[in-house]
Structure formats: structure tokens, C-alpha cells
């Protein structure tokens, strides 16, 4: 039996710059029941506060609702582990909510097979930014990737589309069914998970030109 090991805050993420969550790795418990508490202060302030919500985001986490989230201030966060034998504290973590955004995936993915004048067929992939993202005002600058594969294939083919919310895929095989997904990443943030999978079959009656 011993004091707890040093916890580490290993991840903080915000879906929208309006709320955020931080997660920690507990470290060893020293063989004893161990309590964890997250405390934080904000840049330029002397007050220290305890985590407002340990439940919403699951074990070893702290959720900051709208009421507790500010993009104007850096958060200085630590986690303290305590058992009967003693306590230990994580290194302080500095968090700027602007730089931890992991958005929801893009929405309204639509797939359409089109044909050029020269009879060349392509798949037109279109989507919209995530609902919460105010892209129009420049509040978020979003980049996108799409991935697609035929049903039989093992590997996804990934295309980076920059800020475009549409993409044309050429050289697809007639009669094949293709699966498509999109994801997005804000400036200096993190990729969303891949969005809902959509599928489309390339008709056989279109002939592909070399």
C-alpha cells in the first residue's frame, strides 16, 4: 500500500468552443481506494475552482458546460489523487478552448452519379458543415476529407478537399457499389470522427472512357 501515482491529464476536447471536456489517466492507486479531483483556475485570476461536472463525460473526466466555458481565458488545470497514504498532483495543463475543437462530422452527405459531355462518368459528393459550426462568419475555418471504397475493397481511398464542401471522383467501376464518408477539421483543431456512411452503385449503362 502506498500513496497514489501521479495522474496525467491526457486530452481535452470541445465540440463547438462552447463546452469542453478533459480526461485524465489515473496512475496507480497504491492498492487503496483513491479519490480524484480536478481543479482549475483561469489566466489572470487567483481563484481556484473544482470541476463542475464529473459525470457527463464518463469516468476520469470533467465536463465544462456553457456556463463554465470561456474562449477568452486560458484554463490552468490540475488533477489531484488522494488515498489514505497520501496524495499526488498532475502537472498543470494549460488549455485554450480555441485549440481543442473536435467537431461533429459534416452532415447531409449526398452522392450523385453524373456524366460529362464526353460520356465520362463521375461521382459527385456533396456535404454541409456540422450544424454547430458557424463557418460563414469565419468563426470556424473548416477543412474536409472524404474517403471512399468499393464494397469489395479493403482499403479506403482518401481525398483531402480543403475548404470545399463538394468533390468529384472519377474513374469508378460500373456495376460496383461504393461507400463514402466525410470528416472535418477546424483550423488548429482535431479531425472529427468519420460521418455516417452512404453508399451508391455506379450504373452499368454508363461507359467509362480511358
Amino acid at each position: 500500500q502506498s500513496p497514489p501515482g501521479k495522474p496525467e491529464i491526457h486530452k481535452c476536447r470541445s465540440p463547438d468552443k462552447e463546452t469542453f471536456t478533459c480526461w485524465w489517466n489515473p496512475g496507480s492507486d497504491g492498492g487503496l481506494p483513491t479519490n480524484y479531483s480536478l481543479t482549475y483556475s483561469k489566466e489572470g485570476e487567483k481563484n481556484t475552482y473544482e470541476c463542475p461536472d464529473y459525470k457527463t463525460s464518463g469516468p476520469n473526466s470533467c465536463f465544462f458546460s456553457k456556463q463554465y466555458t470561456s474562449i477568452w481565458k486560458i484554463y490552468i488545470i490540475t488533477v489531484n489523487a488522494t488515498n489514505e497514504m497520501g496524495s499526488s498532483t498532475s502537472d498543470p495543463l494549460y488549455v485554450d478552448v480555441t485549440y481543442i475543437v473536435e467537431p461533429e462530422p459534416p452532415r447531409n452527405l449526398t452522392l450523385e452519379v453524373k456524366q460529362l459531355k464526353d460520356k465520362k462518368t463521375y461521382l459527385w459528393v456533396k456535404w454541409l458543415p456540422p450544424t454547430i459550426t458557424d463557418v460563414k462568419t469565419g468563426w470556424f475555418t473548416m477543412e474536409y476529407e472524404i474517403r471512399l471504397k468499393s464494397e469489395e475493397a479493403d482499403e479506403w481511398e482518401i481525398h483531402f478537399t480543403g475548404h470545399q464542401t463538394q468533390f468529384k471522383v472519377f474513374d469508378l467501376y460500373p456495376g460496383q457499389k461504393y461507400l463514402v464518408q466525410t470528416r472535418c477539421k477546424p483550423d488548429h483543431g482535431y479531425w472529427s470522427r468519420w460521418g455516417q456512411e452512404k453508399s451508391i452503385e455506379i450504373p452499368n449503362d454508363f461507359t467509362l472512357k480511358d
Epitope: I71, I74, Y94, H188
Partner: antibody
Framework: EVQLVQSGAEVKKPGSSVKVSCKAS????????IHWVRQAPGQGLEWMGE????????NYNQKFKGRVTITADKSTSTAYMELSSLRSEDTAVYYC???????????WGQGTLVTVSS | DVVMTQTPLSLSVTPGQPASISCRSS???????????LHWYLQKPGQSPQLLIY???NRFSGVPDRFSGSGSGTDFTLKISRVEAEDVGVYFC?????????FGGGTKVEIK
């Protein structure tokens, strides 16, 4: 304790490439961006680019685009900076640096001197 | 790219006396989110740079309170209220509002 340990000094010929490594320890490697900054002898600091080790997404300073490649190996918690088509002006100390969940640098490697000379 | 201009280039200070370094940016450092990402680093002789001040005026963990930062928009100042022998080195201002991040040319602080 957070540590960034860089590879040793290198002497290179003009036109060749150099690859500098930065081994991270004391934290979850995939959680934080790693940046590369260089400093020519007696000069100021110059930001070269950054990588998110979780998915190897990179941003580069356009000045170096096409010549610099930043990579990360999650299995060894190591970031790399490769600079190609070296010229004498690339003689500098190259630093890796780590941010928090912020856009400033809290931890720095010890630096790697790269000398480009014929 | 944003050009960061520091003055003076060098500074010789008597221990216990104050020192002031100015940093001017070629464009506003106010981010679209309202924050100003102007930071100060100190590079002691033979060492890597270390963070002193982040976001204009916030001392980083472990930085003595004799260091203070101020300013807004394009004009910023680092002040050392009472210079100590351990404060010698080159001070750099840096902006991370705009990509690429850029640094000032540095101000060398020596002890008289």
C-alpha cells in the same frame, strides 16, 4: 517529467538532406502538437512547422514548403524533421518544441546543430 | 508574414534596476476569437528558449513576478522590475495569432 531529447549534431553537404529526431517522454505523445523552430548562428528564431502526432496532420511555414517534411512515429514517441536541398543558409540549431492545448511553446528540446558546408 | 520588431537590440542593466523591452508587430495580433497571442521567451546562454509570458501579460508557471508584460494591438512591452544576474540572455517576443508564427530579432540583456 516532460522531456524532448533530440538527435546529435550533423554536418552535411549542400544539396543533401538532414533528418533530425525528437524523442518525447513523460506525457501522452499523441495528445500534443510538436513544432520545429530553427535558429541560425547569432540570429533569431524561425518557426518551420508543426505536427499533430495523433494523425500526422501537418502545417508548414510556406517558406520551407516543399523542402521540409515533419513526421511522427507513435510507436516510439518520436517526431522527425527532414530538410532537403540544403544550402549554407540552413546552418542552424534546430529545436523541437511542444505546446499545451494552446498555440505557444512550453517545452523545448535541447537543440540539434546542423552545419551545411562543402 | 507578420514582422516582429524588437527594441533595443541590447541592454546593459545594473542588478536591482528595472529593464524594459519593446516589441512591435507589423499587423494587429488580435485573433478572430478576441485573444491576443503575443508571448515572451528568454534564451539563457547555451540553453534552449523558455517561456516567460503568454498572451501579453500572463506569467508562465514558475516565472518570478518581477517579469510583467503589457500592450495591445501592435505594441507590446516586457518589463523586469529588478534585474537579477540570472536574467541575462536574449529575450524574444513571438506571435502565434497568424500563421506562420513569427519571432522578434531578440534583445540581449547583460549585467553591468
Amino acid at each position: 517529467e516532460v522531456q524532448l531529447v533530440q538527435s546529435g549534431a550533423e554536418v552535411k553537404k549542400p544539396g543533401s538532406s538532414v533528418k533530425v529526431s525528437c524523442k518525447a517522454s513523460g506525457y501522452t505523445f499523441t495528445s500534443y502538437w510538436i513544432h520545429w523552430v530553427r535558429q541560425a548562428p547569432g540570429q533569431g528564431l524561425e518557426w518551420m512547422g508543426e505536427i499533430d502526432p495523433s494523425d500526422s496532420y501537418t502545417n508548414y511555414n510556406q517558406k520551407f514548403k516543399g523542402r521540409v517534411t515533419i513526421t511522427a512515429d507513435k510507436s516510439t514517441s518520436t517526431a522527425y524533421m527532414e530538410l532537403s536541398s540544403l544550402r549554407s543558409e540552413d546552418t542552424a540549431v534546430y529545436y523541437c518544441a511542444r505546446s499545451f492545448f494552446t498555440n505557444w511553446f512550453a517545452y523545448w528540446g535541447q537543440g540539434t546543430l546542423v552545419t551545411v558546408s562543402s | 508574414d507578420v514582422v516582429m520588431t524588437q527594441t533595443p537590440l541590447s541592454l546593459s542593466v545594473t542588478p536591482g534596476q528595472p529593464a524594459s523591452i519593446s516589441c512591435r508587430s507589423s499587423q494587429s495580433l488580435v485573433h478572430s476569437n478576441g485573444n491576443t497571442y503575443l508571448h515572451w521567451y528568454l534564451q539563457k546562454p547555451g540553453q534552449s528558449p523558455q517561456l516567460l509570458i503568454y498572451k501579453v501579460s500572463n506569467r508562465f508557471s514558475g516565472v518570478p513576478d518581477r517579469f510583467s508584460g503589457s500592450g495591445s494591438g501592435t505594441d507590446f512591452t516586457l518589463k523586469i522590475s529588478r534585474v537579477e544576474a540570472e536574467d541575462v540572455g536574449v529575450y524574444f517576443c513571438s506571435q502565434s495569432t497568424h500563421v506562420p508564427f513569427t519571432f522578434g530579432g531578440g534583445t540581449k540583456v547583460e549585467i553591468k
